[in-house]
C-alpha cells in the first residue's frame, strides 16, 4: 500500500544514520554476556570464518545474513539462555536487539530483499484463488506472457 | 565442492547461448495446450499483469520468479492436468520444461541466487552441530565477529 511504501522510504532515508546506533546497541548487549561465553570457549579455532564474510559481501549476501540471523535467534540463543539463570535476561536482550535490527533491515527493503515477498505475486495468487476453476484456465492461457516475463528477467541478468 | 563450482561455471558460460533454445522449448510445449485453455478462458482481463514484470525486473526479481515458477508447478499445473485426459501429457511436458529451466537457472547461481544456500553458512552450522554443547559457547563468544560481518554487509549496501 502507499502508506507502507512511504514508511519504507522513510526507514531507508533515516537508516544509514541509525546504523552506528544499532550496531552500538548490539555491541553493548553482547558486552554483558561476552566474558561468560568466551571463558567457556576452550577452542582457539574460529567458527565464524572469513568465508562467511565473503558470502555476506557476495551475490548470496542477503541469504547468508538472513540465515545467520535466523541461526542465532532460533538455534544458538535459545540454548545459550539456558546455560545460566544470571545470563538469561542478557542473552534475551541481545536477541531482542538482533530482532530489532532485522526488522529495520526488512523495512528498508534494499537491505534484506531476500526476505521480502513480491506484492505482484501475491496479487496474482489472490486473483487466481478468487477465480476458482476459471483461474486455472486464465493462468494456463496466459503462460506465454509468463514466458515473456521470464525472458525479460533472464535478459536483464545476462546484461548485468 | 570444487567440482560443483566448475560445473556451475560451465553452466554459466554456456547458459546465455542456451537461453533462446530453452525459451523456444517452453513456447513449443505451451503451443500444444494454448488453444485448449484459451478457449475456456472467458475473461479478457489479465491475470499476469505488468506489475509482475516490474517485480521480475526489480530488487525482488529472483523471489518473484522463484515464487511464480513454484506457483505454476505446484498449484496451477496439477489442476490443469486434470481438466482433460487428452491434455494431461502436454501439460506434464510443459511442467517438465519449466522444471528444466529452473534447474539450469539454479545451476548458474547468478540467475536464481535467492534459491541458493550460502556454503559458508552451511559450514558454520555443520561445525556448530559437531561441537555440540561447545558450539553454543563458540557461537556466542564470537558474536562480536558476527556484528562486524553485519556491519560490513550494511556498509556495502549503503555504498551500493
Amino acid at each position: 500500500s502507499p502508506g507502507q511504501g512511504t514508511q519504507s522510504e522513510n526507514s531507508c532515508t533515516h537508516f544509514p544514520g541509525n546504523l552506528p546506533n544499532m550496531l552500538r546497541d548490539l555491541r553493548d548487549a553482547f558486552s554483558r554476556v561476552k566474558t561468560f561465553f568466551q571463558m567457556k570457549d576452550q577452542l582457539d579455532n574460529l567458527l565464524l570464518k572469513e568465508s562467511l564474510l565473503e558470502d555476506f559481501k557476495g551475490y548470496l549476501g542477503c541469504q547468508a545474513l538472513s540465515e545467520m540471523i535466523q541461526f542465532y535467534l532460533e538455534e544458538v540463543m535459545p540454548q545459550a539462555e539456558n546455560q545460566d539463570p544470571d545470563i538469561k535476561a542478557h542473552v534475551n536482550s541481545l536477541g531482542e536487539n538482533l530482532k530489532t535490527l532485522r526488522l529495520r533491515l526488512r523495512r528498508c527493503h534494499r537491505f534484506l530483499p531476500c526476505e521480502n515477498k513480491s506484492k505482484a505475486v501475491e496479487q496474482v495468487k489472490n486473483a487466481f484463488n478468487k477465480l476458482q476453476e476459471k483461474g486455472i484456465y486464465k493462468a494456463m492461457s496466459e503462460f506465454d506472457i509468463f514466458i515473456n516475463y521470464i525472458e525479460a528477467y533472464m535478459t536483464m541478468k545476462i546484461r548485468n | 565442492s570444487p567440482g560443483q563450482g566448475t560445473q556451475s561455471e560451465n553452466s554459466c558460460t554456456h547458459f546465455p547461448g542456451n537461453l533462446p533454445n530453452m525459451l523456444r522449448d517452453l513456447r513449443d510445449a505451451f503451443s500444444r495446450v494454448k488453444t485448449f485453455f484459451q478457449m475456456k478462458d472467458q475473461l479478457d482481463n489479465l491475470l499476469l499483469k505488468e506489475s509482475l514484470l516490474e517485480d521480475f525486473k526489480g530488487y525482488l526479481g529472483c523471489q518473484a520468479l522463484s515464487e511464480m515458477i513454484q506457483f505454476y508447478l505446484e498449484e496451477v499445473m496439477p489442476q490443469a492436468e486434470n481438466q482433460d485426459p487428452d491434455i494431461k501429457a502436454h501439460v506434464n511436458s510443459l511442467g517438465e520444461n519449466l522444471k528444466t529451466l529452473r534447474l539450469r537457472l539454479r545451476r548458474c547461481h547468478r540467475f536464481l541466487p535467492c534459491e541458493n544456500k550460502s556454503k559458508a553458512v552451511e559450514q558454520v552450522k555443520n561445525a556448530f552441530n559437531k561441537l555440540q554443547e561447545k558450539g553454543i559457547y563458540k557461537a556466542m563468544s564470537e558474536f562480536d565477529i558476527f556484528i562486524n560481518y553485519i556491519e560490513a554487509y550494511m556498509t556495502m549496501k549503503i555504498r551500493n
Epitope: - | M39, D44, N45, L46, K49, E50
Partner: antibody
Framework: EVQLVESGGGLVKPGGSLKLSCAAS????????MYWVRQTPEKRLEWVAT????????YYPDSVKGRFTISRDNAKNNLYLQMSSLKSEDTAMFYC???????????WGQGTLVTVSA | DIVMTQSHKFMSTSVGDRVSITCKAS??????VAWYQQKPGQSPKLLIY???TRHTGVPDRFTGSGSGTDYILTISSVQAEDLALYYC?????????FGGGTKLEIK
Amino acid sequence: EVQLVESGGGLVKPGGSLKLSCAASGFTFSDYYMYWVRQTPEKRLEWVATISDGGSYTYYPDSVKGRFTISRDNAKNNLYLQMSSLKSEDTAMFYCARGYYYGLFTYWGQGTLVTVSA
Amino acid sequence: DIVMTQSHKFMSTSVGDRVSITCKASQDVNTGVAWYQQKPGQSPKLLIYWASTRHTGVPDRFTGSGSGTDYILTISSVQAEDLALYYCQQHYSTPYTFGGGTKLEIK
C-alpha cells in the same frame, strides 16, 4: 459500461504526422491489452498495433512498423497512436479496441477518420 | 501472413431464413477464429470467438462452427436488424488478419 472514444483524426498530407488518442472509461484500463484497428474506405479491416497492459510490449504488422507507435498513459486512461511518414493508403477510419491479449477485439470505439491526401 | 477469405461479398436473405456465412483460412488456425458484425454507421461488434464461443449478450440465433481452415457463421432465423457486414478474423497468430467481409442484405 465500456466506453472508448477516439479523437485526433483529420486531413494530413503524405509524409506528414498525426497523433490519435483514445479515452477509455467504464473498466480498469490498466488490466487490459489495447489495440488500434483501421478500416479502409473499401471497408477492409486491418490490425494496426497492440500494446500490453503496462506498455512494455508493443506489436505491429509490417505495413506500419517503424512509422506508427502505440503508447498508453494508464494514469489518464488514455491510449495513443503516433503516426508518421503517412501515405495515401493509410487513409482509414481508426478504431481503438480492448481485448484479449492474443488479438481478439472485444470492445471497439466509434472511430476517428484519418485522410492522407495532397 | 494468414489470409482469410470470405468468398461471398454479398448474401441476400429473407427474415426468418437460415443463413450461413463462410470463411476460409490459408492455413490451419486451430479454431482461433472470431466473427464481427458491423451495422451501417456503427463500429464492429464481437459476436463469436474461438470459432464457436458466443460473446456476452449475443443472441443465440448466432452460432459459429468449424475447425482447421474452414469456418461458418450461421444465423438460424434472420431478423431485420441483422442487416450488416460480417467479418471473420483469425486470432491464432500475428499478424492478426480479417476476411474481406460479407454484406448480408434483407430481401
